[in-house]
């Protein structure tokens, strides 16, 4: 799995361990092994929500299989909640879009998932 | 709707008020509630298009519905005039990726929009 | 098509003319005109795979067709080898999602490819 | 070192409500999902859920939707199941146990036997 | 919901011979590249050990004489040799999707 996040919010707001934890509770949200998660935080960015500049975010999680109505709604409770508590950003100014990637969509190690 | 703009097009090139305008044209030309809009806009990227490094852009506009062939025409004509206009990159060094969003594969305010 | 690395390698690590073997290497592996090929590299980005931050990539191939089974490990076994070579990336430490886009839900010159 | 220590045995009867606790200690309690696992006297394990021990969100297998709950306490590092209108086919022996990342149990409680009769 | 079919339901074997468990999944228990098995043993009266995790990994502390292997859908569970302490009942578990289903356990008796 291969969670972004894109945000306003500065680099200096990103909290020292943030993705590491993300790492640990997507490895529990999505039962993979946390050796095959990808995070990736991108601050300080030129974006608006709602046509404010207040602090935003516009993420995807990408993973094969594990996607699906209860499990985005379980996910977008988890990653909302992380976002709010780590970097302040209301729930509300968050958008999360979810992919069910097929293995043979997924490239690594020079191959495929297929 | 999310429309995220990547281009290589410097920062102090991007005009004061280009990410409210783009939120109020595509309020208008999705017919969706501004409220709803986020716009993303990523310059001074290391990017080509065609081998060289003119002002280019890759794009993408996410929207759960309201998107389809005559739609996509419709939006690509707005967009490509936006970026032309605003940031002078040619409409032939624009790619812009159309996704149709489920629902459920949408986050938002801790759940999501199924 | 349009190729996408976002990888926490430093800019000063990407070597000259790293864009220009892209759109070489993928014109020849689409068999597409290289005037049509898009790249697009980040470095310097805040990532981790698997926890950690040695170098990695989160990379994306979007095209219309030719996209596929035997395509993408292909394109995987190219794209990992660039990487490795010319960043100093573990293929185990890369991602590529790969995506056959609709031609409609392409935008280009002020339309679509539909 | 790691421990997961639940309660004790329970005898109830038909319609009676029962909480089972399982007490972790040892590790970051909300980094872990928990899982439940019964077994009915001589029987097989079957899975019950699992709760999300960062978001309080569980998930019921189908044969555990309705009078099944699970619930945490984190300030005390504690997991709950709550079984209400207690039937006798509910006897069985429960189990608490950790997931490690990739959704194997690593770490078992020692089981909490639930008897019910009338 | 994946079944998963142990094989043999029990085993009677003398010490020092090797004992093999199947465990077959009705669909593939594959996602990236690991197979989401893991094997457990269960003594009466107490509760079930991790024992193989992800198809082929030893959980710290299990003898090497506890080996995992398959892919997909079949999957295998070696115990060589066997001794008197691992009379016990094994499961197999797939983590794949959920619900997290079980095997429905084989009993191994040391002669």
């Known amino acids: 799995p291969m969670f972004i996040v894109n945000t306003n919010v500065p680099r200096a707001s990103v909290p020292e361990g943030f993705l590491s934890e993300l790492t640990q509770q997507l490895a529990q949200a999505t039962g993979k092994p946390a050796q095959y998660i990808a995070v990736h935080v991108v601050p300080d960015q030129l974006m608006t929500f709602s046509g404010t500049n207040d602090p935003c975010a516009l993420c995807s999680l990408h993973s094969i299989g594990k996607i699906g109505g209860a499990q985005n709604r379980n996910y977008s409770k988890l990653l909302c909640g992380l976002l709010s508590d780590r970097l302040h950003i209301s729930p509300d100014r968050v958008y999360i879009n979810y992919y069910d990637m097929n293995a043979a969509n997924v490239g690594w190690n020079g191959s495929t998932f297929a | 709707p999310m429309f995220i703009v990547n281009t290589n097009v410097p920062r102090a090139s991007v005009p004061e008020g280009f990410l409210s305008e783009l939120t109020q044209q595509l309020a208008q030309a999705t017919g969706k509630p501004a409220q709803y809009i986020a716009v993303h806009v990523v310059p001074d990227q290391l990017m080509t298009f065609s081998g060289t490094n003119d002002p280019c852009a890759l794009c993408s506009l996410h929207s759960i519905g309201k998107i389809g062939g005559a739609q996509n025409r419709n939006y690509s004509k707005l967009l490509c005039g936006l970026l032309s206009d605003r940031l002078h990159i040619s409409p032939d060094r624009v790619y812009i990726n159309y996704y149709d969003m489920n629902a459920a594969n949408v986050g938002w305010n801790g759940s999501t929009f199924a | 098509p349009m190729f996408i690395v976002n990888t926490n390698v430093p800019r000063a690590s990407v070597p000259e003319g790293f864009l220009s073997e892209l759109t070489q290497q993928l014109a020849q592996a689409t068999g597409k005109p290289a005037q049509y090929i898009a790249v697009h590299v980040v470095p310097d980005q805040l990532m981790t795979f698997s926890g950690t931050n040695d170098p990695c990539a989160l990379c994306s191939l979007h095209s219309i067709g030719k996209i596929g089974g035997a395509q993408n490990r292909n394109y995987s076994k190219l794209l990992c080898g660039l990487l490795s070579d010319r960043l100093h990336i573990s293929p185990d430490r890369v991602y590529i999602n790969y995506y056959d886009m609709n031609a409609a839900n392409v935008g280009w010159n002020g339309s679509t490819f539909a | 070192q790691i421990q997961l220590v639940q309660s004790g045995p329970e005898l109830k009867k038909p319609g009676e409500t029962v909480k089972i606790s399982c007490k972790a200690s040892?590790?970051?309690?909300?980094?872990?999902?928990m899982n439940w696992v019964s077994q009915p006297p001589g029987k097989g394990l079957e899975w019950m859920g699992w709760?999300?021990?960062?978001?309080?969100?569980?998930t019921y297998a189908d044969d555990f939707k309705g009078r099944f709950a699970f619930s945490l306490d984190t300030s005390a590092s504690t997991a709950y199941l709550t079984i209400n209108n207690l039937k006798n086919e509910d006897t069985a022996t429960y189990f608490c146990?950790?997931?490690?990342?990739?959704?194997?149990?690593?770490?078992w409680g020692q089981g909490t036997t639930l008897t019910v009769s009338a | 919901n994946i079944v998963l079919t142990q094989s043999p339901a029990s085993l009677a074997l003398s010490l020092g011979q090797r004992a093999t468990i199947s465990c077959r999944t009705s669909?593939?228990?594959?996602?990236?590249?690991?197979?989401?098995m893991h094997w457990y043993q269960q003594k009466p009266g107490q509760s079930p050990k991790l024992l193989i995790y992800?198809?082929?990994n030893l959980e710290s502390g299990v003898p090497a004489r506890f080996s995992g292997s398959g892919s997909r859908t079949d999957f295998t569970l070696t115990i060589d040799p066997v001794e008197a302490d691992d009379a016990a009942t094994y499961y197999c578990?797939?983590?794949?999707?959920?619900?997290?289903?079980f095997g429905g356990g084989t009993q191994l008796e040391i002669k």
């Open positions: 146990a950790r997931s490690n990342y990739g959704n194997y149990f690593d770490y």
């Open positions: 040892g590790y970051s309690f909300r980094n872990y999902g």
């Open positions: 709760i999300n021990t960062y978001t309080g969100e569980p």
């Open positions: 669909e593939s228990v594959d996602s990236y590249a690991s197979s989401f």
């Open positions: 992800l198809a082929s």
């Open positions: 578990q797939q983590s794949n999707e959920d619900p997290r289903t």
